[in-house]
Amino acid sequence: SPVPFGPEGRLEDKLHKPKATQTEVKPSVRFNLRTSKDPEHEGCYLSVGHSQPLEDCSFNMTAKTFFIIHGWTMSGIFENWLHKLVSALHTREKDANVVVVDWLPLAHQLYTDAVNNTRVVGHSIARMLDWLQEKDDFSLGNVHLIGYSLGAHVAGYAGNFVKGTVGRITGLDPAGPMFEGADIHKRLSPDDADFVDVLHTYTRSFGLSIGIQMPVGHIDIYPNGGDFQPGCGLNDVLGSIAYGTITEVVKCEHERAVHLFVDSLVNQDKPSFAFQCTDSNRFKKGICLSCRKNRCNNIGYNAKKMRKKRNSKMYLKTRAGMPFKVYHYQLKVHMFSYNNSGDTQPTLYITLYGSNADSQNLPLEIVEKIELNATNTFLVYTEEDLGDLLKMRLTWEGVAHSWYNLWNEFRNYLSQPSNPSRELYIRRIRVKSGETQRKVTFCTQDPTKSSISPGQELWFHKCQDGWKMKNKTSPFVNLA
């Protein structure tokens, strides 16, 4: 079919012309005010210079106004996340105006062409905002642009072109290809709004990164490190999502940003927290669970303005589905080794016992390697709120059956046949809750029995000499 777009980003119906000389020219971008929670309702179309629809459709000039901006599309239809997000916004902000920016004709093209159209779409949104600003009581500060994928960069352009400063832009996994490393005026950046928060859910350091890896907002949140999202593995996808292909894995991870945002709207009582950290590896090590100096924040809609920060990278773990909230714990474990433990890393698990619930057997992920005669830090997380921690059980699983480990065990045995056992001595474990910021120290029940070997377990209880607890919590944590 002929490309229905003129050079000015306007739409020409070339498919059917009743008269040879007549060409119908329409705006290429439509603004649909969603006037009902019913996704089937056609809503109201707004256009610059036409005030009647604003009155007819009860546009609330003093309320918050959300603009939802979709991204590139292969099918040319609105995907199902859209009506979920519209509904969630209506639920959370009952008086708000929710406007869907329909740029499907300009997005339903080759990706490179869609990218080249983002600027003109941003201009259209800016024109709409400039016109609305002419109305009494309308404030740009009440405007929140929410852009998914390519739509995040459209929001950036809109924020850049508008007269004044929009209140907030949320980038939901902003697109990576053709934007990674781009100049700040050619992508979403902190300059585009008073507050720019970003969720990154599909970043890859190898292969094609569908989502942008670099930080582009005031705060940039990388759930699960910003790459492999729980529930989006090929096995999960085959069972639960239509089609069950690699394409669906990509869609699942990329779209997870939208669902995390929806979750933050509808599950207010279960807010997820993210923690500032220089990189994903340090976060996985459990080093970054501090809320001091605004180092933690709510994610999604509930994120607190952090205009003093720019490109602040924050991390968290999540569940595989809504509600996504998990409870993070930092474990500081001082390990002594009196017997040579060889090259193999111990496979350690911890079970936390709390006043509300007990955790599952949680693996202590060894990001690099365990340092002996040193304090090792680990990150563990639970899906349920355990309450106050009462005790914990450390388990050392028997040797993992990899050829590498078996060979190492055999080699260790040959080098020291009289003492093949491996032992770690752990006297205490210090635990810090990310969500409450409380610190508790746990000791072995019997100080003389603080060694653990493969296949054994070691119990820890609150230390008798008074367990440490810091009540200095962050202002965000008090909202939990």
Epitope: S1, L11, K26, E40, E42, Y45, G76, N80, V86, I241
Partner: antibody, heavy 120, light 112 residues
């Protein structure tokens, strides 16, 4: 009330061209997508594709790429299905059906159908 | 493409009794808690009419004796109590957000 009214039955010879119309009323034509569905005699329903009634951009199912063309006359709130180089296997009833852009993509209103017979 | 398999191909039900029609999808049609499965009724010489959308929601003006259930890959249309006017062919239809959209093979319902 909402109505989709299709053009009357057609009798064509193989190799000819047919153009079926679907006129919408009772709603804003450009605010809903338009599907085309084929039903061969005694057979089940087969989705042919859809057209964005605002932009005019068509999307075709794999089996309907090539000889089939969707178009619009927006000013007349009318969608068209054109089939070129007709074959005997095109004998069927063709339905237009609308769906909401913003919703769950089900087909809430259908045209009455246009019966096409292709025979030499 | 998602293949929808309906069973039985035909059934005969006595007036006032329950009719149950099954539709099995080759892959899940669920998305974030919703099922994108719809049901239509078609009488001879007429276009299909929407009965149920999103697995269990009743279409506009459809009597409450029609109900839909299911999730993932397995869906059911129930009609109870069956009335004379329910004699028709019933089709399931999936509308996930990646066309092509597909229909089941149809189930012909006769009233005994």
């Amino acid at each position: 009330q909402i109505q989709l009214v299709q053009s009357g039955p057609e009798l064509k010879k193989p190799g000819e061209t047919v153009k079926i119309s679907c006129k919408a009323s009772g709603y804003t034509f450009t605010n809903y997508g338009m599907n085309w569905v084929k039903q061969a005699p005694g057979k089940d329903l087969k989705w042919m594709g859809w057209i964005n009634t605002y932009s005019g951009v068509p999307t075709y199912a794999d089996d309907f790429k090539g000889r089939f063309a969707f178009s619009l006359e927006t000013s007349a709130s009318t969608a068209y299905l054109q089939i070129n180089n007709l074959k005997n296997e095109d004998t069927a009833t063709y339905f237009c059906a609308r769906f909401s852009y913003y919703g769950r993509h089900y087909f809430d209103y259908w045209g009455q159908g246009t019966t096409l017979t292709v025979s030499s | 493409d998602i293949v929808l398999t309906q069973s039985p191909a035909s059934l005969a039900v006595s007036l006032g009794q329950r009719a149950t029609i099954s539709c099995k999808a080759s892959q899940s049609v669920d998305y974030d808690g919703d099922s994108y499965m719809n049901w239509y009724q078609q009488k001879p010489g007429q276009p299909p009419q929407l009965l149920i959308y999103a697995a269990s929601n009743l279409g506009s003006g459809i009597p409450a004796r029609f109900s839909g259930s299911g999730s993932g890959t397995d869906f059911t249309l129930n009609i109870h109590p069956v009335e004379e006017e329910d004699a028709a062919t019933y089709y399931c239809h999936q509308s996930t957000d990646d066309p092509p959209w597909t229909f089941g093979g149809g189930t012909k319902l006769e009233i005994k």
